[in-house]
């Protein structure tokens, strides 16, 4: 039985040209995290963090994605096209797969508010 829950940064907004941290946290389970996948709204993989192999950033995102902090991901040089859903997928033993969702809105405004509150989707 899967007892854990994924907490995410929820709905966040950030300024065009700026950067943002995408963060998920798995709690309420003793399952061991073996891999975390980060996916974009169109299901393209941004990055994978494997317990043994470490981080792999996919070539299309190499220049704009930085691993961390922790199991999170930092998106840099944001464009309007980055607006949309992002998913973290936690592969765990023996629970299986947990999935969290974050919605990022990239704003033209120079005074874009960067809100990052933890919430359970």
């Amino acid at each position: 039985m899967m007892t854990g829950t994924i907490e995410t940064t929820g709905n966040i907004s950030a300024k065009k040209g700026g950067s943002v941290i995408l963060q998920c946290h798995l709690s309420s389970t003793m399952a061991q995290v073996t891999q975390v996948n980060w996916e974009q709204h169109d299901h393209s993989l941004l990055a994978i963090r494997n317990a043994e192999l470490g981080w792999h950033i996919y070539p299309a995102f190499k220049d704009r994605v930085a691993p961390g902090p922790g199991l999170g991901l930092t998106l840099q040089s944001l464009t309007m096209n980055d607006t949309g859903e992002y998913f973290c997928t936690y592969h765990t033993y023996p629970d299986g797969t947990y999935r969290g969702r974050i919605f990022l809105e990239v704003l033209e405004s120079s005074v874009a508010e960067h809100s990052a509150r933890f919430q359970i989707p």
Epitope: M1, M2, M30, A31, Q32, V33, T34, Q35, N50, A51, E52, H91, Y93, P94, D95, G96, T97
Partner: antibody
Framework: EVQLVQSGSELKKPGASVKVSCKAS????????MNWVRQAPGRGLEWMGW????????AYAQDFTERFVFSLDTSVTTAYLQISSLKAEDTAVYYC?????????????WGQGTLVTVSS | DIQLTQSPSFLSASVGDRVTITCRAS??????LAWYQQKPGKAPRVLIY???TLQSGVPSRFSGSESGTEFTLTISSLQPEDLATYYC?????????FGQGTKVEIK
């Protein structure tokens, strides 16, 4: 080369305790969950449970909650199985087995097994 | 808990025969199933994981398939060294239990 090397056979009296060791080499112990499996003479494989090698937290299968303890010493890359208040029915080969960290999991490396015999 | 029922418990076949062993799960387990071979006096070794993926170094005469909650291990052409007991195991959730085992004898 990944290896799991277990301690040697043990002959114990009923009521005694035993501690079986499983020395991991060729990989980072804390990245892979470790399992314990029992096989009584002439019987099948029984999954006893596992230990989260990242946090040290153990989880036990239903029949192994009472007298069985899984532990780790990461400084010597070794997992342990301790059984207390031994009974004749604990006579078995005990295996440690590493969980592969593919997305579907399986036990990709096994120790050679440790025979524990409980007899008066 | 999800139960695994493995059959047959024993089979005897000739060298070159095609052999199939079945493992049925009481509920859906997706592809979280592995097959192991245990030769007498030895530790088990994984043959198939993810229901259908052949472990590196395992001969190609071994294959796995799935259909709903039924999983099959096939040995396309039995060899003398295949004398062993074969176990299925579910890995989708605690407990990661094994099937009862199938002992394969060479006629």
């Amino acid at each position: 080369e990944v290896q799991l090397v277990q301690s040697g056979s043990e002959l114990k009296k009923p009521g005694a305790s035993v501690k079986v060791s499983c020395k991991a080499s060729g990989y980072t112990l804390t990245n892979y969950p470790m399992n314990w499996v029992r096989q009584a003479p002439g019987r099948g494989l029984e999954w006893m449970g596992w230990i989260n090698t990242n946090t040290g937290s153990p989880a036990y299968a239903q029949d192994f909650t009472e007298r069985f303890v899984f532990s780790l010493d990461t400084s010597v890359t070794t997992a342990y199985l301790q059984i207390s208040s031994l009974k004749a029915e604990d006579t078995a080969v005990y295996y440690c087995a590493r969980t592969a960290i593919t997305s579907v999991y399986h036990f990709d490396y096994w120790g050679q097994g440790t025979l524990v015999t409980v007899s008066s | 808990d999800i139960q695994l029922t493995q059959s047959p418990s024993f089979l005897s076949a000739s060298v070159g025969d095609r052999v199939t062993i079945t493992c049925r799960a009481s509920q859906g387990i997706s592809s979280y199933l592995a097959w192991y071979q245990q030769k007498p006096g030895k530790a088990p070794r994984v043959l198939i994981y993810g229901a259908t993926t052949l472990q590196s170094g395992v001969p190609s005469r071994f294959s796995g398939s799935e259909s709903g909650t039924e999983f099959t291990l096939t040995i396309s052409s039995l060899q003398p060294e295949d004398l062993a007991t074969y176990y299925c195991q579910k890995l989708n959730s605690h407990p990661c239990s094994f099937g009862q085992g199938t002992k394969v004898e060479i006629k």
